[in-house]
């Protein structure tokens, strides 16, 4: 089964420059019909999978990957990939997460404005997806096996 799958997009909320200890959420977006979103680190050997997929708009689905307390080890490039059965998509562009020491100074904002990589169309409807599988959480990081396009 072959389908031309659009590349996913990746963004970060509230931004890509995050104070140490603060939270950040990566948002991966793709077409409707995605079963699994994967957030990859700079190498493809470390990733998180989630099947908690919601419908961001009539033509777009999304998944969110939250880091509650950012550490220096979380800094670096991230990208998304998704599984729309029976095929994996190409990767999104990289999004660089910067982690900064909290200075507490009045002139330094806590975060920079939200940033994204890949297609930048924002969903007009953020309602919960009726198609999302129930009670599927983030998977532990584990080794990635290179996929074969089918």
């Amino acid at each position: 089964q072959e389908e031309d799958l659009p590349r996913p997009s990746i963004s970060a909320e509230p931004g890509t420059v995050i104070p140490l200890g603060s939270h950040v959420t990566f948002v991966c977006r793709g077409p409707v019909g995605v079963q699994t979103f994967r957030l990859e680190r700079e190498s493809r050997s470390t990733y998180n999978d989630t099947e908690d997929v919601s419908q961001a708009s009539p033509s777009e689905s999304e998944a969110r990957f939250r880091i509650d307390s950012v550490s220096e080890g979380n800094a670096g490039p991230y990208r998304c990939i998704y599984y729309k059965p029976p095929k994996w998509s190409e990767q999104s562009d990289y999004l660089e997460l910067l982690v900064k020491e909290t200075s507490g100074g009045p002139d330094s904002p806590d975060t920079e404005p939200g940033s994204s990589a890949g297609p930048t169309q924002r969903p007009s409807d953020n309602s919960h997806n009726e198609h999302a599988p129930a009670s599927q959480g983030l998977k532990a990081e584990h080794l990635y096996h290179h996929h074969h396009h089918h």
Epitope: Q35, P86, K139
Partner: antibody, heavy 110, light 109 residues
Amino acid sequence: QSVKESGGRLVTPGGSLTLTCTVSGFSLSNYNIQWVRQAPGKGLEWIGFISPAGNGYYASWAKGRFTISKASSTTVELKMTSLTASDTATYFCARHWDLWGPGTLVTISS
Amino acid sequence: ELVLTQTASSVSAAVGGTVTISCQSSQSVYSNYLSWFQQKPGQPPKELVYWTSTLQSGVPSRFSGSGSGTQFTLTISDLECDDAATYYCLGGYSGWFYAFGGGTEVVVK
């Protein structure tokens, strides 16, 4: 690339059985593996599948009695419990829906 | 409960003719996730059509799928003797659940 089921046999009512789906030529990390059954002379019935992430999804009637899991990098198992005569069928596994095994026959009888 | 109904349990037509098999779902399939399978006795099913209307590789263009929402059809034109088989529809639903239709036997005269 192939899939093949094994483990089908005669089981007495109330018993349990584990079927194995062995794949070759592709990675379980990249595909759903579906389980389907077909009673003699009847239609196809979806049981459930395991996703690349390792999550199991089941038909409502199969929840509780049927469990799908990855046993190794090349095998997926279907564990069935509290078997009755109505579970007598040929059991198929499939890579998503495009590549099927020949099936394995499970007979529940005393 | 998810129910896929194939209204005709059997249809027949002469060689060179056309048959249409219908499949009705009790609820909308997700993202046009509707497939058609062909099964011959003693063999596993073979996927012919997926995503409602896309032909699987190697399937002749005599087969075509159409429909949306809850109503779908498989049309086989220029019937050949080799098309004699049972055909099943399969729907994919919210939350990644699937259901098969009851099957329609195609008899080629």
